[in-house]
Interface confidence: low
């Protein structure tokens, strides 16, 4: 099962940098964000995230979440990403905000072990 | 207690095969990959390669390619390594080690824990 | 050869800080993760993505990531910290994906 995953990071703002994957801002932050999710969703369904994306508005991040299939479904995706957000914000300094998820209704190209 | 359990040490010719045995246990097996790991004598760390207990996938070092297989038994929580056409400098103490296997996308995060405690090869005429 | 560079030897006094580095291009979409072995032993884990720890291992190991180097940092080092140090990371190139490790890093105590 794959969710598309979209959120605000409030109280980061975006630069050039989150365009162009060889700077230290944008790797930091991805590392953060793929180890947190990581995190979040600990249980053995979880098969890792892909296709991260870094637009304007503060900081918005898209990405795709993959998961095995009947694991998992959307409002449990959202509700434990929701549930972890005080946590994003102690260990990571990341203010999550406007959190959307939903279906991705094809499988897509994702790399696999 | 996460635990896996080695099998003993083996002693091979050139050119005959090993098979290395890993038991777990303390954890769902299938909720994570294998990663194998050796270290010839006074040396550092080479990974060799790495199985889902999920599905099976396996990804292996390209340097060994065509010559190491990876397999998992479900059933009793077992992963195997073999290794074929053995030569001296296949010497040395083969490790399995529990992967997490976030291996989609971006995420190349990857840590092994915990490790089992090791199966001494030696390939000798 | 090892893809990810350490120093071979580092030496601390009892009780004092000392950061073992590690630099490699697959470090900068990667945490790195830290071995501790000690001669005779399998490797231990002892540090992985940015904070963690497993359990069991105490907090004077800390570590952090700028750019391409990875850094373990023993913050207070007793004599049972004297053991062999290695980093690893996942290395991907043209979409195939392997382990990298460092050569090592053999801490003394002093």
């Known amino acids: 099962s794959f969710f598309f995953l979209s959120f605000h990071i409030s109280n980061l703002q975006f630069n050039s940098s989150l365009e162009d994957p060889s700077t230290d801002y944008y790797q930091e932050l991805q590392r953060d964000i793929s180890e947190m999710f990581l995190q979040i969703y600990k249980q053995g369904g979880f098969l890792g995230l892909s296709n991260i994306k870094f637009r304007p508005g503060s900081v918005v991040v898209q990405l795709t979440l993959a998961f095995r299939e009947g694991t998992i479904n959307v409002h449990d995706v959202e509700t434990q990403f929701n549930q972890y957000k005080t946590e994003a914000a102690s260990r990571y300094n990341l203010t999550i905000s406007d959190v959307s998820v939903s279906d991705v209704p094809f499988p897509f190209s994702a790399q696999s072990g | 207690e996460v635990q896996l359990v080695q099998s003993g040490a083996e002693v091979k010719k050139p050119g005959a095969s090993v098979k290395v045995s890993c038991k777990a246990s303390?954890?769902?097996?299938?909720?994570?990959?294998i990663s194998w790991v050796r270290q010839a004598p006074g040396q550092g760390l080479e990974w060799m390669g790495w199985?889902?207990?999920?599905?099976?996938?396996?990804n292996y070092a390209q340097k060994l390619q065509g010559r190491v297989t990876m397999t998992t038994d479900t059933s009793t929580s077992t992963a195997y390594m073999e290794l074929r056409s053995l030569r001296s400098d296949d010497t040395a103490v083969y490790y399995c080690?529990?992967?997490?296997?976030?291996?989609?996308?971006?995420?190349?995060?990857?840590?092994?824990?915990?490790w089992g405690q090791g199966t001494t090869v030696t390939v000798s005429s | 050869s090892y893809e990810l560079t350490q120093d071979p030897a580092v030496s601390v006094a009892l009780g004092q800080t000392v950061t073992i580095t590690c630099q490699g291009d697959?470090?900068?979409?990667?945490?790195a993760g830290w071995l501790q072995q000690k001669p005779g032993q399998a490797p231990v884990l002892v540090l992985y993505?940015?904070?963690s720890r497993p359990s069991g291992i105490p907090d004077r190991f800390s570590g952090s990531t700028s750019g391409n180097t990875a850094s373990l940092t023993i913050t207070g080092a007793q004599a049972e910290d004297e053991a062999e140090y290695f980093c690893?990371?996942?290395?991907?190139?043209?979409?195939?994906?392997?382990?990298?490790f460092g050569g090592g890093t053999k801490l003394t105590v002093l």
């Open positions: 080690a529990r992967d997490p296997h976030i291996l989609t996308g971006y995420y190349r995060g990857g840590w092994f824990d915990p």
């Open positions: 303390g954890y769902t097996f299938t909720n994570y990959g």
């Open positions: 199985i889902s207990a999920y599905n099976g996938n396996t």
């Open positions: 697959s470090l900068r979409t990667s945490y």
């Open positions: 993505g940015k904070t």
């Open positions: 690893h990371s996942r290395d991907s190139n043209d979409n195939y994906l392997e382990v990298v």
